[in-house]
């Protein structure tokens, strides 16, 4: 779509005459008559193809054309088409005088040919005037002519239709070819694609405008790279959206199970040692001279039993002193005035004679100790079962009863509650401190979810794209558990498709 | 082939909330080629745009509609919904969705049957 | 708010050519589109980006738009073409209807 447009510059009839020879009477009041059509090589009568147009009476005999953009006898003379421009054309200028009309000598009756000249050739679009002279024996024609393209048409043959505009179909301005030069900050084959801030995840975030970042669900942080964890999450984090890996000494479904009571809360008082012994539980074994739960209790300074052969112990402010029996002396009564002959052993002990029958030593047989054998053996002193089981003298050993979900010789090892599969109908385990429990599928229920239920948050199927729907720890809600390729709290948004994706 | 289909009350109560929901299939609504919209024809008149909405959630209301018009679309059931606020009669129209082509320069190839919504007492 | 302006009705016989304007402010500088709505139906786009026909509608509908008018031609106009036809354009980010032609085929 353009315009053929012809600038009438200067017309000479000097004779005033008509082409058939005769004069002008009184003299050639002239009009023009323009006639555009397709390239022939020789011009031919017909259809006026491209466009013709009149002008009104614009002078007589001889006289200059100025330029008139509005009202009647406009110039330059404008030929509109709304085809492909061909880049070649023929062109018809006739003179014409009128002894009638000035305004609309078109129509007069009477009107007789002055002289006519005929172009063909080539001609490009563009802005610059292509300017000519035609001469015959009686007149001269000075003109320029040019084809330029209508508004919002573009290109080598003003073919190709381009608005600028700035809503939400595109945000463009046009090149002089036609094609779209998006406004800054959009893009797309139509500029109707924001550009994003920079670094914002290409999968995870989206914009309205440019330089936003707006955060699929799941994701979070300023480019929407970082996922959001599990709803109820405590000691976790994520990779992919609605998880909860738990941290180093947490454990559960939500992370909230304390499995390093001791690092986390230091229960153990007074230098003794901590141990842990699964979720929230640990053992406290206590330095001499100390005893209760943590440890936190003190013991009397006779309570380790500091005086031997039957001394006995006196506690004082911030010591003791033994009171020995006849035939012992010393601190803690360790020295003996007695000697083999005094039969010193108990309990079947032997005697053997030390520095000359200065003093003895006593050889106990199994299960009694003491300088006189006169003491049972407690096997139990050194604390040896682990994870708060209980010690049991046993003839000459003993034996370690474990608290429930413990084992082994010294209860060292922990056993799981789920190891023995107690969750029924695919529900999955987890070990808590309090036993094992059991998360469910869609339609059960209970402690080991071996109650069928039909109504339940998984029975009205919330979950897409093949995702297993699990009740979590009350039957009223529902977790999903995506299969891969998928996030969201229904599973119901796919990973990593192109910006058509919804989301 | 790509259909739309509106859905809601047929009768709302002045000064009550309009709400009707449209229902795409045969195309995903998460294109990023399309705009989805509503528009609305007042009993023995002409056609009324009252707004549209983009996948990500973007919307554009006419202004003289704006202050009562929610336009809120859900990718996963491939649907967009239409709420207009403190109806009078003057809101009774058949209204219908149609889809808005980035490529057809934004000409609305698509259309839904159109649902009659009528505000009485 | 901006405007687009229709004839209310158009009367022309089988056979002959039908024009309806639609007028707005500087509406060459933007891309119309038509719609054809026959009674009890919903409408039908038979002309976007001023000039272009969609896939299904017949030659004889023709578009044009510059200054500020865009007309729709039917050219050979049959009685099936009787119906309203509502002229759209987008100012900004708000879509505009035309008040609608109805034209009658006699």
């Known amino acids: 779509s353009g315009i053929f447009q012809l600038r009438l510059q200067e017309f000479a009839n000097e004779r005033g005459m008509l082409a058939n020879g005769r004069p002008c009477e009184p003299g050639c009041r002239t009009f023009f008559r323009i006639c555009l059509k397709h390239y022939q090589a020789t011009f031919s009568e017909g259809p006026c193809t491209f466009g013709n147009v009149s002008t009104p009476v614009l002078g007589t005999n001889s006289f200059v054309i100025r330029d008139k953009n509005s009202g009647s006898g406009r110039n330059p003379l404008q030929l509109p088409f709304n085809f492909t421009w061909p880049g070649t054309f023929s062109l018809n200028i006739q003179a014409w005088h009128t002894p009638g009309d000035d305004l609309r000598p078109e129509t007069s009756p009477g009107n007789s040919l002055i002289s006519q000249i005929i172009i063909q050739g080539s001609l490009a679009v563009g802005k610059n005037w292509k300017s000519d002279e035609q001469n015959n024996t009686l007149t001269r024609l000075r003109y320029s002519y040019r084809v330029v393209c209508s508004d919002n048409y573009y290109g080598d043959s003003c073919s190709r239709l381009c608005k600028k505009r700035d809503d939400h179909f595109g945000h463009y301005e046009c090149q002089p070819d036609g094609s779209l030069s998006c406004l800054p900050g959009w893009t797309g084959k139509y500029c109707d694609q924001p550009i994003c801030l920079s670094g914002c995840h290409e999968q995870n975030g989206y914009c309205s405008k440019p330089d936003e970042c707006n955060c699929r669900p799941g994701w979070q942080g300023p480019l929407c790279n970082e996922c959001i964890p599990h709803n109820g999450c405590r000691h976790g984090t994520c990779t992919i959206p609605w998880q909860c890996a738990c941290d180093e000494g947490w454990g559960g479904l939500f992370c909230d199970q304390d499995l390093n009571y001791c690092t986390h809360h230091s229960p153990c008082k007074n230098g003794s040692t901590c141990s842990n012994s699964g979720p929230r539980g640990y053992t406290c074994t206590c330095l001499p001279g100390y005893t209760g739960e943590h440890c936190e209790l003190e013991l009397s300074k006779c309570a380790s039993n500091p005086c031997r052969n039957g001394g006995s112990c006196k506690d004082h402010e911030n010591s003791y002193h033994c009171l020995c029996p006849p035939g012992y002396y010393g601190q803690h009564c360790e020295h003996s005035t007695l000697t083999c002959a005094d039969s010193p052993c108990f309990n079947g002990g032997s005697c053997r004679e030390r520095n000359q029958g200065a003093s003895y030593a006593c050889e106990c047989p199994p299960n009694f100790t003491g300088s006189n054998c006169e003491k049972k053996v407690d096997r139990c002193t050194s604390n040896p079962c682990a994870n708060g089981g209980q010690c049991l003298n046993r003839g000459p050993s003993r034996t370690c009863r474990c608290r429930p979900g413990f084992t082994g010789t010294h209860c060292e090892l922990h056993i799981s509650d789920c190891a023995r599969s107690p969750c029924a109908h695919g529900g999955t385990c987890h070990d808590l401190e309090n036993g094992p429990v059991c998360t469910c599928p869609a339609g059960f229920s209970g402690r080991r979810c071996e109650v069928r239920i039909t109504n339940d948050a998984c029975a009205s199927g919330p979950c897409f794209n093949g995702a297993t729907c699990y009740t979590g720890l009350s039957p009223n809600n529902f977790v999903c558990n995506c299969p891969y390729g998928f996030v969201g709290s229904r599973c119901e948004f796919p990973v990593g498709l192109p910006p058509s994706f919804p989301w | 082939e790509v259909q739309l289909q509106e859905s809601g009350p047929g009768l709302v109560k002045p000064s009550e909330t309009l709400s009707l929901t449209c229902t795409v299939s045969g195309g995903s609504i998460s294109s990023s080629s399309y705009y989805w919209g509503w528009i609305r024809q007042p009993p023995g008149k002409g056609l009324e745009w009252i707004g549209d909405?983009?996948?990500?959630?973007?919307?554009y209301y006419n202004p003289s509609l704006k202050s009562r018009v929610t336009i809120s679309v859900d990718t996963s059931k491939n649907q967009f919904s239409l709420k207009l606020s403190s109806v009078t009669a003057a809101d009774t129209a058949v209204y219908y969705c149609a889809r808005e082509d980035v490529i057809l320069r934004g000409g609305s190839d698509y259309w839904g049957q159109g649902t009659l919504v009528t505000v009485s007492s | 708010s901006y405007e687009l302006t229709q004839p209310p009705s158009v009367s022309v016989s089988p056979g002959q050519t039908a024009s309806i304007t639609c007028s707005g402010q500087r509406l060459g500088d933007k891309y119309a589109s038509w719609y054809q709505q026959k009674p009890g139906q919903s409408p039908v786009l038979v002309i976007y980006e001023d000039s272009k026909r969609p896939s299904g509608i017949p030659e004889r509908f023709s578009g044009s738009n510059s200054g500020d008018t865009a007309t729709l031609t039917i050219s050979g106009t049959q009685p099936m073409d009787e119906a309203d036809y509502y002229c759209q354009a987008w100012d900004r980010d708000t879509g505009v209807f035309g008040y609608g032609t109805r034209v009658t085929v006699l």
């Open positions: 909405i983009y996948y990500t959630g973007s919307t």
